[in-house]
């Protein structure tokens, strides 16, 4: 996700197909002020971001909207009037999906449901992620709309759930970045709980001397 | 398994144009998500990407190119044309179309025509 | 655009032979970098996408790596079917640009 030019390392993310963020570390050009330039069409004039991100009062990204019809931006970062960093990019490639909105559980005998609202675009998938305190890792499955069934749970323990979106690698490319997940929901006996306790963690063999 | 054949080259007058086809068969050049696109190499093997025109019509040009070609398609005959005008020599090549392998994103190209040889010369 | 700097540009080998070329990007471009086999007087084949998935029906001596600006194609073991001309191709930057080729020939 990182470019290299002139001692410039630029990232972009695509936030749900709604807004571009560019950032940069500009170690070559302490305590300037870079500036941003960028359209989504080659016939277009540049234009100047109006967005600016700072880092200890200096710019360091930029935050611009755009459309799901925009798919190529072109941009350009300068020192002055000077270019640093000049590129184009198909925006698709560094999609980062938003959280899942609106999760509800419902539970069924020895398994559970989680469900949230299907984000507007295709090629996604939703990952629920669930622990008991007697899991050290946790575990996993997804499904291609928000509508994720785990089974097999034991109703007597108590279980942690989390969810998040990623972009399909068969549409995407490999790398995008999923979304942050969802806040942690604890359960027992088909009830929320505050917590679950601790994993539990195995106890490391002693050394014999 | 999808087969492309290009079709049109041949010898063509510096300041001329050029219109190839690309006939599809064994995958309907409509199906959502494909991209469709013109390549060409050059006498010294060198690839240039020209355009790509998507699954929903959408096109998309090399800015190298972009105010000399335009890039159709003919959904009834499940083809795809090149059309180039202002010739000259350096657009000696052979064409080929080919189809994007990525969900649309237009990432690598997994089918590939057998190229079509353009030569441009008075 | 971003420029694809393959090298070598030629490089003779013997059949049972590990070859490994590189392609360097002008720009980070992740991991989206294909690779493609072009036998004369014939159309490229994909071989590998996004640096190190091979392609379906692509023998396994065949493999890619790297990430960022700087990939790898290696053979590890050269059939005689091998000897052709291989290019890389970066697709994040618009618009997408080949490397130059690696012609490999039999020594």
């Known amino acids: 996700q990182v470019a290299t030019g002139e001692g410039l390392q630029i990232q972009i993310m695509y936030f749900n197909l709604e807004t571009v963020q560019v950032t940069w570390n500009a170690s070559h050009y302490p305590r300037s002020n870079l500036s941003f330039h960028y359209k989504f069409s080659r016939d277009e004039a540049y234009d100047q971001c109006t967005v600016y991100i700072l880092q200890e009062g200096h710019t360091s990204g930029c935050l611009l909207d755009a459309e799901q019809q925009d798919d190529i931006l072109y941009f350009s970062i300068r020192n002055g009037t000077h270019p640093v960093f000049t590129a184009s990019r198909w925006i698709f490639y560094y999609l980062k999906p938003s959280s899942p909105k609106q999760v509800s559980f419902s539970w069924h005998q020895d398994a559970v449901t989680l469900t949230c609202s299907d984000l507007s675009y295709r090629g996604l998938l939703y990952e629920v992620q669930y622990r008991s305190p007697f899991d050290t890792e946790w575990q996993s499955k997804q499904e291609n709309t928000c509508n994720v069934t785990v089974e097999d749970l034991d109703a007597e323990k108590c279980y942690a759930f989390r969810a998040r979106v990623k972009a399909m690698e068969d549409a995407y490319g490999p790398d995008t970045y999923p979304s942050d997940w969802s806040e942690v929901t604890c359960w027992q006996r088909g009830e929320t709980r505050d917590s679950c306790p601790e994993p539990r963690t195995p106890p490391k063999p002693k050394l014999s001397k | 398994q999808v087969q492309l054949v290009e079709s049109g080259g041949g010898l063509v007058k510096p300041g001329g144009s050029l219109r190839l086809s690309c006939a599809a068969s064994?995958?309907?050049?409509?199906?959502?998500?494909?991209?469709w696109t013109w390549i060409r190499q050059f006498p010294g093997k060198g690839l240039e990407w020209m355009g790509y025109?998507?699954?929903?019509?959408?096109?998309y040009y090399n800015p190298a190119l972009k105010s000399r070609i335009t890039i159709s398609r003919d959904n009834a005959k499940n083809s795809l044309y090149l059309q180039m005008n202002s010739l000259r020599a350096e657009d000696t090549a052979v064409y080929y179309c080919?189809?994007?392998?990525?969900?649309?994103?237009?990432?690598?190209?997994?089918?590939w025509g057998q190229g079509t040889l353009v030569t441009v010369s008075s | 655009d971003i420029q694809m700097t393959q090298s070598p540009s030629s490089l003779s080998a013997s059949v049972g032979d590990r070859v490994t070329i590189t392609c360097r990007a002008s720009?980070?471009?992740?991991?989206?970098l294909h690779w493609y086999q072009q036998k004369p007087g014939k159309a490229p084949k994909l071989l590998i996408k996004?640096?190190?998935r091979l392609q379906s029906g692509v023998p396994s001596r065949f493999s890619g790596s790297g990430s960022g600006t700087d990939f790898t194609l290696t053979i590890s073991s050269l059939q005689p079917e091998d000897f052709a001309t291989y290019y890389c191709?970066?697709?994040?930057?618009?618009?997408?640009?080949f490397g130059q080729g690696t012609k490999l020939e039999i020594k």
């Open positions: 064994g995958f309907s050049i409509t199906t959502s998500g494909y991209y």
């Open positions: 080919a189809r994007s392998l990525y969900g649309g994103y237009k990432d690598a190209f997994d089918s």
């Open positions: 191709q970066q697709s994040p930057g618009f618009p997408p640009t």
């Open positions: 025109i998507g699954y929903n019509s959408k096109t």
């Open positions: 996004f640096a190190s």
């Open positions: 720009q980070s471009i992740g991991t989206s």
